[in-house]
Interface confidence: low
């Protein structure tokens, strides 16, 4: 999937299986990514688990779990708030669009999470205070938490390099781990560009991600995934000058 | 997750063979504070861990039952506005602690927010 980190780095990651997205003293978010096509290095998010940890007199521990074709508007125990404590309503789930768009407000840690199902896959967006992001006990032994440190270098796909080759065979070459998988109805480059331009007129990294996804998979739903990801940034990002990212930062993760 | 280590350190401090702390002495409160500190140090690796969360609850209960002050020689410096998860605190009828922004405004202007997103392939 494409990842925008807390420090506004933008990466395309081929991480497969379960990876921690956020892990601090208050919240743990884990995603499971699966290949979009057999043999493809490109992956998308098929499962999301969020653990809101027990916090004082505000909330009991609550677990939210979403999977492909299952975007519940409740925690796994069936509740929609933080439990029986005095401040339980400081954690709330709201269904915005049934089966497609859920918002979780965790006021006790100043955090808003948006989970969507777009096509077959899930998208995730969060707004969180720096103080909460950095509420980590042991920095030295902290592993790879994607939102904080980005993807390991060996798990990144350089999709900007891919764009320079995109008119040719670049898309299939980069997306394939082994011999190129046969994607159903992959688009010609021009069609992909046109479809992405409709939804994403600014040629930023969200637009580029959209083109990459269409050329990689042929699945037009990825246009919407990029569009909604940018909409969520508009809603959640505190710096309106940083809505559009244009250059992918190439630093090492961390 | 080293919560079992924290548990056993607390048990040995409060029921060890050499001058155990009885539960109405200052030593008991000191042992509790050490226990709380130990749980905070292991918090990151104990995410979602029932033993960990139960221990944190237990400490909170014992601190209030025995009127232990939460600050003491073993207490760890804490975040300005946000206590460590599940850390013991005086109970309050006001849910202000459950509203981050209200709690934050007491100390400074607006918190700095960050964003992370994951989408597509």
């Amino acid at each position: 999937p494409h990842l925008r980190t807390f420090t506004d780095r933008f990466q395309t990651c081929k991480v497969q299986g379960a990876w921690p997205l956020i892990d601090n003293n208050y919240l743990n978010v884990q995603v499971t990514n699966t290949p979009v096509l057999p043999g493809s290095a490109a992956t998308a998010t098929s499962k999301l688990t969020i653990i809101f940890k027990n916090f004082q007199e505000c909330v009991d521990q609550k677990v939210y779990q979403a999977e492909m074709d299952e975007l519940p508007a409740a925690f796994v125990d069936g509740s929609k708030n933080g439990g029986d404590k005095h401040g339980a309503n400081s954690l709330k789930i709201t269904e915005k669009v049934s089966g497609q768009h859920v918002e979780i407000q965790a006021k006790y840690i100043g955090t808003t999470i948006v989970v969507r199902q777009v096509g077959r896959y899930l998208t995730f967006a969060v707004r969180m205070p720096e103080e909460v992001v950095n509420a980590v006990e042991d920095w030295d032994s902290q592993g790879l938490y994607l939102c904080l440190r980005g993807c390991p270098l060996n798990q990144q796909i350089d999709f900007q390099a891919f764009h320079t080759n995109a008119e040719g065979t670049g898309a299939r070459r980069l997306a394939a781990a082994s011999p190129a998988p046969t994607a159903p109805e992959t688009f010609p480059y021009e069609t992909a560009v046109a479809k992405c331009k409709e939804k994403l007129p600014v040629e930023d990294l969200y637009y580029q991600a959209c083109v990459f996804d269409l050329l990689t998979t042929g699945d037009v739903n990825f246009t919407l995934a990029a569009y909604y990801a940018l909409e969520d940034v508009k809603m959640l990002h505190s710096n309106k000058d940083k809505l559009h990212l244009y250059e992918r930062t190439r630093d090492l993760p961390g | 997750c080293k919560i079992l280590k924290c548990n056993s350190e607390f048990w040995s401090a409060t029921s060890g063979s050499h001058a155990p702390a009885s539960d109405d002495t200052p030593e008991f409160c000191a042992a509790l504070r050490s226990y709380a500190l130990c749980t905070r140090r292991t918090a990151r690796t104990c995410r979602g861990d029932l033993a960990y969360h139960s221990a944190v609850h237990g400490i909170e209960d014992l601190m209030s039952q025995h009127n232990c002050s939460k600050d003491g020689p073993t207490s760890q410096p804490r975040l300005r506005t946000l206590p460590p998860a599940g850390d013991s605190q005086e109970r309050s009828d006001s849910p202000e602690i459950c509203h981050y922004e209200k709690s934050f405004h007491k100390h400074s202007a607006t918190p700095n927010y960050t964003h992370c997103g994951l989408f597509g392939d």
Epitope: Q65 | N7, D49, S54
Partner: antibody, heavy 120, light 109 residues
């Protein structure tokens, strides 16, 4: 020594209920969850659910929802598992086990087991 | 039918190594770090042998070791001894599911 001691064997008729107890000692009861696992004669282990003695939170195996109730009494450090509407296939040895490090992750101390026979 | 598949039985002579496999899905084993193994002698309660895939509780001999590759977790007993003859069960937690394998009978020849 950390120990879980379970109540004695029970014989029940189909449709009845059974309540098995599990008394914990040697550790802080509220610091660990309790899982319940059963084993039918000659069969494998079957997870039934768990309970947090501190909060009373429970999580039951889907197939037992509505028939199983897990409770604890922290004053006596005892966990209870009640199974209702018993049928012959509920004949099994029922074990309680201490959850070592979080819900479901692993069970580090087990009771000796309680044989429940359901027979008309 | 268990969602975690184990061989019915494995056997080995004293001193040999045996490996028991436990195969599940990506969510039950592949993505889970919470795989544990239990030993059960006839008429006795199970005993924890390994947890979190590879970790050994104190008191468990170091001839018991664990590993995981893809959707298969494995328990290896090296230097098999007579007292290792028992049933072995794998157990996995992933998300809200918790599962046991069907069990493997280890016979020491």
């Amino acid at each position: 020594e950390v120990q879980l001691v379970q109540s004695g064997a029970e014989v029940k008729k189909p449709g009845a209920s059974v309540k098995v107890s599990c008394k914990a000692s040697g550790y802080t009861f509220t610091s660990h969850g309790i899982s319940w696992v059963r084993q039918a004669p000659g069969q494998g282990l079957d997870w039934m659910g768990w309970i947090s003695p501190y909060s009373g939170n429970t999580n039951y195996a889907q197939k037992l929802q509505g028939r199983v109730t897990m409770t604890t009494d922290t004053s006596t450090s005892t966990a209870y598992m009640e199974l209702s509407s018993l049928r012959s296939e509920d004949t099994a040895v029922y074990y309680c086990a201490r959850v070592g490090s979080g819900p479901y992750y692993y069970m580090d101390v087990w009771g000796q087991g309680t044989l429940v026979t359901v027979s008309s | 039918q268990s969602a975690l598949t184990q061989p019915r039985s494995v056997s080995g002579s004293p001193g040999q190594s045996v490996t028991i496999s436990c195969t599940g899905t990506s969510s039950s084993v592949g993505d889970s770090i919470y795989v544990s193994w239990y030993q059960q002698h006839p008429g006795k309660a199970p005993k924890l042998m390994l947890y979190d895939v590879t970790k050994r509780p104190s008191g468990v001999p170091d001839r018991f070791s664990g590993s995981k590759s893809g959707n298969t977790a494995s328990l290896t007993i090296s230097g098999l001894q007579a007292e290792d003859e028992a049933d072995y069960y794998c157990h996995s937690y992933a998300g809200t599911d918790t599962l046991f394998g069907g069990g493997t009978k280890v016979t020491v020849l």
